[in-house]
Amino acid sequence: QPDAINAAVTCCYNFTNRKISVQRLASYRRITSSKCPKEAVIFKTIVAKEICADPKQKWVQDSMDHLDKQTQTPKT
């Protein structure tokens, strides 16, 4: 679960240890603030839950790729 350390900065202190199905993911954002202990990805699920994930993990990178492509593909 992401943790807001102040109004402007959200950090991740722990990462999920479960792979999340891309079908459950709606969006993501990158966490790079030097105020945070580590860089992270925060996935938002289709039910609006936010989950911290490790950007070094392949499934996380693949999920970001999937969401990037989905975002730029016009819905028909």
């Epitope: 990158r30 030097s34 860089e39 070094k56 730029q72």
Partner: antibody, heavy 117, light 107 residues
Framework: QVQLVQSGAEVKKPGSSVKVSCKAS????????MHWVRQAPGQGLEWMGR????????KFDPKFQGRVTITADTSTSTAYMELSSLRSEDTAVYYC??????????WGQGTTVTVSS | DIQMTQSPSSLSASVGDRVTITCKAT??????LAWYQQKPGKAPKLLIH???SLEHGVPSRFSGSGSGTDYTLTISSLQPEDFATYYC?????????FGGGTKVEIK
């Protein structure tokens, strides 16, 4: 705050090797990737490669493959870049930078390497 | 490898001007684009990542836009400290590549 401090300027002979260090403070290097980027005099930026200090996995621009070695010591929070078989075209400022996503939000101050006979 | 073509290579502008720099990739980079500012003798400084996300502490006069293969950095009102060289960089896939740079000079 995050700081990357690099070793000092080097003058090298063609055919020799150079090893540049980059000591990090304010971050745990095993949580990120450490990259090396160079810039020849009056030229643009060129990505050389990166290391995941956690598992020592490396990735390089094929242009440098076989000539560059990137290592990291998590106990001292230091990354290293060694370039071998130096030629005059390797004269450049070498930067270390951090970034797990492939863009670089913190940079070292740069190390000037001059290759001259 | 993905090639990045940046234009113009240099431009002259005055304080208060609106400045636009463009960057074109040889394939779709899905908004994985960063912009940097570099001053002589200094390391580059990250301005924008993800095509539009302003880095912490970067003035709001800097903005990024674009999608697919075409991206733009805009400085809405040029300030004296903005005279520098600007680079785009794709982080869609390694090897990560930079544009050739745009030098913004005083008119």
């Amino acid at each position: 705050q995050v700081q990357l401090v690099q070793s000092g300027a080097e003058v090298k002979k063609p055919g020799s090797s150079v090893k540049v260090s980059c000591k990090a403070s304010g971050l745990t290097i095993s949580h990120t990737y450490m990259h090396w980027v160079r810039q020849a005099p009056g030229q643009g930026l060129e990505w050389m490669g990166r290391i995941d200090p956690d598992n020592h996995n490396t990735k390089f621009d094929p242009k440098f493959q076989g000539r560059v070695t990137i290592t990291a010591d998590t106990s001292t929070s230091t990354a290293y870049m060694e370039l071998s078989s130096l030629r005059s075209e390797d004269t450049a400022v070498y930067y270390c930078a951090r970034g797990v996503f492939g863009f670089f939000d913190h940079w070292g101050q740069g190390t000037t390497v001059t290759v001259s006979s | 490898d993905i090639q990045m073509t940046q234009s113009p290579s240099s431009l002259s502008a005055s304080v208060g001007d609106r400045v636009t720099i463009t960057c074109k990739a040889t394939e779709d980079i899905y908004n994985r684009l960063a912009w940097y500012q570099q001053k002589p003798g200094k390391a580059p400084k990250l301005l924008i990542h993800g095509a539009t996300s302003l880095e912490h502490g970067v003035p709001s006069r800097f903005s990024g836009s674009g999608s697919g293969t075409d991206y733009t950095l805009t400085i809405s009102s040029l300030q004296p400290e903005d005279f520098a060289t600007y680079y785009c960089q794709q982080f869609r896939s390694a090897p990560y590549t930079f544009g050739g740079g745009t030098k913004v000079e005083i008119k």
